[in-house]
């Protein structure tokens, strides 16, 4: 806290300019009027203030706006944003995407801080849903943003926003998140033709059910092994050898290298060995010929 001292003669600030960088903390406190600061916030970012000085300026704004800053001030905070606490930000009502962009720009190149997370949360809640423009902006600054949301939060993403998602945005998503995103992606891309559709839907397939994988196997998509390995195990298990062969196309040879890893390992255990042998890859571990497979889960469901 800066002591309350009188402003020295001739040092009262008439405008926010570069001369203020030479003011000591107590002089900034005594000589800069908070209302002047608020009206000239757009100048602050261009002036090489230290963070110590920015603390003083923040204190002045806090006194002027104890209930939270107006958006006209927030939009021009610049580096002063880094001095805000999540508690400060929770008092704000940020509605403009331009304001959001301006503040994210300050933190660009750095990991998401608690301040940024709070800002985004306030902004998205204020909008009611994660619209395409917002998602575009957030994933541009933070590619992992989408995967930081809970399945419940992801449910508010409209299908139209899925067009903004790039494959790398989904890199850290877990199956629960992809379960929510996949149906939205399927809806968003439903009017595309086969090959274009597959290119777009590929990143979301970790949430695809068996019936959709079966349908894809009929479309000559040539899924790569990396995508196949991210599929839900429960969705892969019911696929036949013929369906997997069609799904992977020339990439089917990669199964051999992955035969000890899920979902390939579990899928092999469900296939007849003579069916696996038709692939000519030397996959082992299938059901020996002549054995009868009873699906007890199906039997229980029927009784």
């Amino acid at each position: 806290e800066v002591e309350k001292t009188a402003c020295p003669s001739g040092k009262k600030a008439r405008e926010i300019d570069e001369s203020l960088i030479f003011y000591k903390k107590w002089e900034l406190e005594a000589c800069v009027d908070a209302a002047l600061l608020a009206t000239q916030m757009d100048r602050v970012n261009a002036i090489p203030f230290t963070y110590e000085q920015l603390d003083v300026l923040k204190h002045k704004l806090d006194e002027l706006y104890p209930q939270g800053y107006p958006e006209s001030v927030i939009q021009h905070l610049g580096y002063l944003f880094l001095k805000m606490s999540p508690e400060d930000i929770r008092k704000w009502n940020v509605t403009s995407l331009e304001t959001l962009k301006a503040l994210l720009e300050v933190n660009k190149g750095h990991e998401m801080s608690p301040q940024v997370a709070t800002l985004i949360d306030r902004f998205v809640k204020g909008r009611g849903q994660l619209d395409k423009d917002t998602l575009d902006t957030l994933t541009a600054f933070y590619p992992g943003y989408l995967c930081s949301l809970s399945p419940e939060e992801l449910s508010s993403v409209p299908p139209s926003s899925i067009w903004a998602v790039r494959p790398q945005d989904l890199d850290t998503c877990d199956p629960r998140q992809l379960d929510v995103l996949y149906p939205k992606a399927r809806l968003a891309f439903q009017n595309m033709n086969g090959s274009e559709y597959f290119v777009k839907i590929q990143s979301f397939l970790g949430g695809a059910p068996t019936e959709d994988l079966k349908a894809l196997s009929q479309q000559n998509v040539s899924m790569d092994l990396a995508t196949f390995m991210k599929l839900r195990t429960d969705a892969v298990l019911p696929l036949t050898v013929a369906e997997v062969q069609k799904l992977l196309g020339p990439h089917v040879e990669g199964l051999k290298a992955e035969e000890r890893h899920r979902p390939v390992r579990d899928w092999i255990l469900r296939q007849r060995q003579d069916d696996l042998d038709t692939l000519g890859l030397g996959l082992q571990g299938g059901i020996p010929n002549g054995y009868l497979v009873l699906d007890l889960s199906m039997q229980e469901a029927l009784s």
Epitope: P48, T50, Y79, K83, H110
Partner: nanobody, 115 residues
Framework: EVQLVESGGGLIQPGGSLRLSCAAS????????MGWVRQAPGKERELVAT???????YYANFVKGRFTISRDNSKNTLYLQMNSLRAEDTAVYYC?????????WGQGTLVTVSS
């Protein structure tokens, strides 16, 4: 984290010249601007000069025309060329960097102007 190490201080006669250096290391990509701050015995610290990442310079009135701040990005070094030194320039000179999200300081180098 940014580390700053000053050098170049010493005893100099009035009217003489000195060049201070400040070697920066660590996360230097996060630096927004750097400056020289001095503290004379029994006085408050005061900003002498600042230089931004794009090379814009600012000087305190008491050193204008005598001191020049510069930086060599290839060597990650900040300089302060001090000419026409006076007795009142005697102080510990600190290098300071404002970098995301705080201010970093060197340990200081003593400049004594005396005959």
């Amino acid at each position: 984290e940014v580390q700053l190490v000053e050098s170049g201080g010493g005893l100099i006669q009035p009217g003489g010249s000195l060049r201070l250096s400040c070697a920066a290391s660590g996360n230097i990509g996060s630096i927004r601007h750097m400056g020289w701050v001095r503290q004379a015995p029994g006085k408050e610290r005061e900003l002498v000069a600042t230089i931004t990442t794009v090379g814009t310079t600012y000087y305190a009135n008491f050193v204008k025309g005598r001191f020049t701040i510069s930086r060599d990005n290839s060597k990650n070094t900040l300089y302060l060329q001090m000419n026409s030194l006076r007795a009142e320039d005697t102080a510990v000179y600190y290098c300071r960097a404002t970098a995301h999200p705080t201010d970093y300081w060197g340990q200081g180098t003593l400049v004594t102007v005396s005959s």
